[in-house]
């Protein structure tokens, strides 16, 4: 069987939701010593980067200028060390936003509720779309989808203090082309007095996966790490095939 290197990690720098006409940046984190990285879009070669010097950096950035609906979709990347190619990365969905119109987001029964109450968000957009998306700030990968002609419902069920936070919605013209974001709606959830200190909370840290973690290294340590990584991979493939 053909030997391959471990798959790289593909990430969007800052966010995978890119306003139209702005620049998107995708990072492909592979291995020290990789001489070539390829970015694939919808299964076809999209761009090539060759790091310099290859042994001192573990990945590359691909800049995609002037974002539009034709560049929105599924991206993946691969890399090469010598003549050996890696497996393909997982797929990354790159979305273009700020298309057409702005929806309105509202919450029922209201923006401040007691823990245990049932809450429903409503996203409304009068232009032609049937798919709506709800995102919580700091949790942009946890996209909820709902469908409706003009207005979609997002039932949250009985809420806890973990639901506290700021929410926005989008109308979606297809999976990768979204409207402008709604104005945010902040949901406050009050717990019972004795429960409040024990209630789970959901800190809205920035999306850690939307950070490029490329490192530039010097010295023998990384050369040894590369040798060890390659040796382990070599052993792994021979051991299992």
């Amino acid at each position: 069987p053909k030997q391959t290197l471990p798959k790289p990690i593909i990430r969007a720098e800052s966010t995978y939701m890119v306003p139209k006409e702005k620049q998107a940046t995708l990072c492909c984190q592979g291995s020290y010593g990789a001489v070539e990285y390829q970015l694939h879009f919808e299964g076809s070669l999209f761009a090539v980067e060759r790091p310099k010097p290859p042994e001192r950096i573990n990945g590359v950035k691909f800049h995609i200028p002037d974002m539009n609906s034709r560049k929105a979709g599924r991206y993946s990347c691969i890399y090469r060390v010598g003549e050996l190619w890696s497996e393909r990365s997982d797929l990354l969905d790159l979305v273009v936003t700020e298309m057409y119109d702005t929806p309105t987001l509202s919450v029922h029964p209201g923006p401040e509720v007691t823990s245990g109450e049932k809450v429903t968000f409503y996203c409304r957009l009068d232009t032609a779309t049937s798919m709506f998306l709800l995102l919580k700030e700091g949790r942009s990968r946890d996209v909820q989808r709902s469908y409706g002609k003009v207005q979609a419902e997002f039932p949250m069920g009985p809420v806890t203090t973990a639901h506290r936070g700021s929410y926005r919605c989008f109308g979606s013209y297809n999976n990768y082309a979204w409207s402008f974001p709604s104005e945010p709606v902040k949901l406050l959830v009050t717990g019972d007095i004795e429960n409040t200190s024990l209630a789970p909370t959901d800190p809205t840290f920035p999306d850690s996966w939307d950070t490029c973690l490329l490192t530039r290294e010097t010295g023998l340590q990384k050369d040894l790490a590369l040798w060890d990584h390659t040796a382990q991979n070599h052993h792994h493939h021979h051991h299992h095939h």
């Epitope: 509202s106 029964p109 209201g110 709606v185």
Partner: nanobody
């Protein structure tokens, strides 16, 4: 079921004031508001009020901000719309609504009153 009864409409000259009332019978309504519809125009939101566990929230259409004030008397289950500095373009049928989403959004379970006419002459 919820019954909504509006009152307080009438005719007034531009710059004048009116106070609309909406009494809700049945269970307590936490989000109530006012919508209006002028002849030949679409119904539009005017103002709404939501009473949360610790805080009361209000929302207004841009066209009435600074002129209209919405308040709620929870004991009477009644919502009021104080309308000052009225303009001819405020002329419309005003409808009370209960069980809205906040801010100022009609949902499938929203309940409506019969309406009260407001006429502002120049």
């Amino acid at each position: 079921d919820v019954q909504l009864v509006e009152s307080g409409g009438g005719s007034v000259e531009a710059g004048g004031s009116l106070r609309l009332s909406c009494a809700a019978s049945g269970y307590r309504q936490r989000t109530m508001g006012w919508f209006r519809q002028a002849p030949g125009k679409a119904r539009e939101g005017v103002a709404c009020i939501y009473t949360g566990p610790t805080t009361t929230f209000t929302d207004y259409a841009d066209s009435v901000k600074g002129r209209f004030t919405i308040t709620q008397d929870n004991a009477k289950n009644t919502v009021y719309l104080q309308m000052n500095s009225l303009k001819p373009e405020d002329t419309a049928m005003y409808y009370c609504a209960a069980n809205l989403a906040y801010p100022l959004t009609i949902i499938p379970d929203t309940r409506w009153g019969q309406g009260t006419q407001v006429t502002v002459s120049s």
